[in-house]
């Protein structure tokens, strides 16, 4: 989280972001919020981005006003109209790009006074893991998939009842380039696993960390996934 | 769950101030505007002003200027609004309302002017 | 002041019909328009903000559009319950200034 406040006393406004993940190819959030003004036509909204010459976006008098956008933003961006009354200026980013990461300045001019604040934006691919059993192999053997994950991650296998072991002399990871030749898809082999057990295959870059769980028991199979954004820190 | 609780009806002689409260709760009180709004008889909504708790900035409307002050007790998430010199027009029901878009309203207070 | 001019005062019609309300502004707000619903001995409830954003909860029937100094509120399927009367309202520019209100009754 960065609190960031306007420079001349009471002509300040606090103005906060949240430094956040994007998944290349899907659709974005650069957080930012403000002290709300009571009417639109004093509120003006400017984000920017270090190293960009252009405007990332700017709303002013109650529209959007993008003569000054940057050509790499060029019908990407969006705020949430509906709520820059009540404080809210983040930004939707549309196909997020391996390029829209960086410093990113949120700007806030209100009847009360201006403030900004910074933002770091990463961007990468991450996608949540399945761990099926693979009754192909020769011997009890578990498959953890994921589609897309960008930068290369690393794979860590898991066992509840083996806790602490070493899985990576037991487990073979590849990567596989995805036809857009940035992304990369994420196939885990785990082999010798016992029935009554849970596993757990844990993929992990940079920009996230998702967790798949396979508990196989001899009259059943439960799955579970979830995935979390790193370094998601407010400012 | 967002509550907005007026105080009491009140009738008042002309000539006589009013003090209207407007307890929150469910929410941060401190970082949304609390609006004031009122409504005559069989009319329809005027404007008052609003104050911004967090730092105490004040918006009124011209028309109510001098004559009305809001005010909040941030540690009992309280608004209110007191007018004075009442006459007769004022007759009205008053509203709390939360935030630029008036997302919620009290359940408003009647003030009766009346000799 | 910016006038809201809504229109009509009042109206009646059937269960099911598409009902209009106009609200038209003596300068240009932008977008910066919302919509409530007021029944009778209630308080308002906000049901449009931004001229087309329906507030949270509030049925898809109702609908708003317009900019610059037209605006239209709309419920495609006038159902029992939505007897009330209905407000527009600018917050572009203080003084916040509401429409004088349309009383919408079921034939």
């Known amino acids: 989280l960065i609190i960031g406040f306007g420079i001349s006393g009471r002509h300040s406004i606090t103005v906060t972001t949240v430094a956040s993940a994007g998944n290349i190819g899907e659709d974005g959030i650069l957080s930012c919020t403000f002290e709300p003004d009571i009417k639109l036509s004093d509120i003006v909204i400017q984000w920017l981005k270090e190293g960009v010459l252009g405007l990332v976006h700017e709303f002013k008098e109650g529209k959007d006003e993008l003569s000054e956008q940057d050509e790499m933003f060029r019908g990407r961006t969006a705020v949430f109209a509906d709520q820059v009354i009540v404080g809210n200026a983040s930004l939707r980013l549309k196909n997020v790009q391996l390029t829209d990461a960086g410093t990113y300045k949120c700007y806030i001019i209100t009847s009360k006074g201006k403030g900004n604040a910074n933002l770091e934006y990463k961007t990468g691919a991450f996608s949540m893991p399945e761990v099926n059993v693979d009754y192909n192999a020769s011997s009890e053997t578990l498959r953890c998939e994921a589609p897309r994950w960008f930068p290369q991650p690393t794979v860590v296998w898991a066992s509840q009842v083996d806790q602490g072991a070493n899985f990576s002399e037991v487990s073979n990871t590849s990567f596989e380039l995805n036809s857009e030749n940035v992304t990369m898809k994420v196939v885990s082999v785990l082999y010798n696993v016992t029935i009554n057990n849970t596993y757990s295959c844990m993929i992990e870059n940079d920009i996230a960390k998702a967790t798949g769980d396979i508990k196989v028991t001899e009259s059943e199979i439960k799955r579970r996934s979830h995935l979390q954004l790193l370094n998601s820190k407010a400012s | 769950e967002v509550q907005l609780v007026q105080s009491g009806a009140e009738v008042k002689k002309p000539g006589a101030s009013v003090k209207v409260s407007c307890k929150a709760s469910?929410?941060?009180?401190?970082?949304?505007?609390m609006n004031w709004v009122r409504q005559a008889p069989g009319q329809g909504l005027e404007w008052m002003g609003g104050i911004y708790p967090n730092r105490g900035n004040i918006e009124y409307n011209e028309k109510f200027k001098g004559r009305v002050t809001l005010t909040v007790d941030t540690s009992a998430s309280t608004a209110y609004m007191e007018l004075s010199s009442l006459r007769s027009e004022d007759t009205a029901v008053y509203y709390c309302?939360?935030?630029?878009?008036?997302?919620?309203w009290g359940q408003g207070t009647l003030v009766t002017v009346s000799s | 002041d910016i006038v809201m001019t809504q229109s009509p005062s009042s109206l009646s019609a059937s269960v099911g019909d598409r009902v209009t309300i106009t609200c038209k502004a003596s300068q240009d707000v932008r977008t910066a328009v919302a919509w409530y619903q007021q029944k009778p001995g209630k308080s308002p409830k906000l049901l449009i903000s931004s001229t087309s954003y329906r507030y949270t909860g509030v049925p898809s029937r109702f609908s708003g559009s317009g900019s610059g100094t037209d605006f239209t509120f709309t419920i495609s399927s006038l159902q029992p319950e939505d007897i009330a009367t209905y407000y527009c309202?600018?917050?572009?520019?203080?003084?916040?200034?509401f429409g004088g209100g349309t009383k919408v009754e079921i034939k």
């Open positions: 309302a939360r935030d630029s878009r008036f997302s919620y």
């Open positions: 309202q600018q917050h572009y520019s203080t003084p916040l200034t």
């Open positions: 469910g929410y941060t009180f401190t970082s949304s505007w």
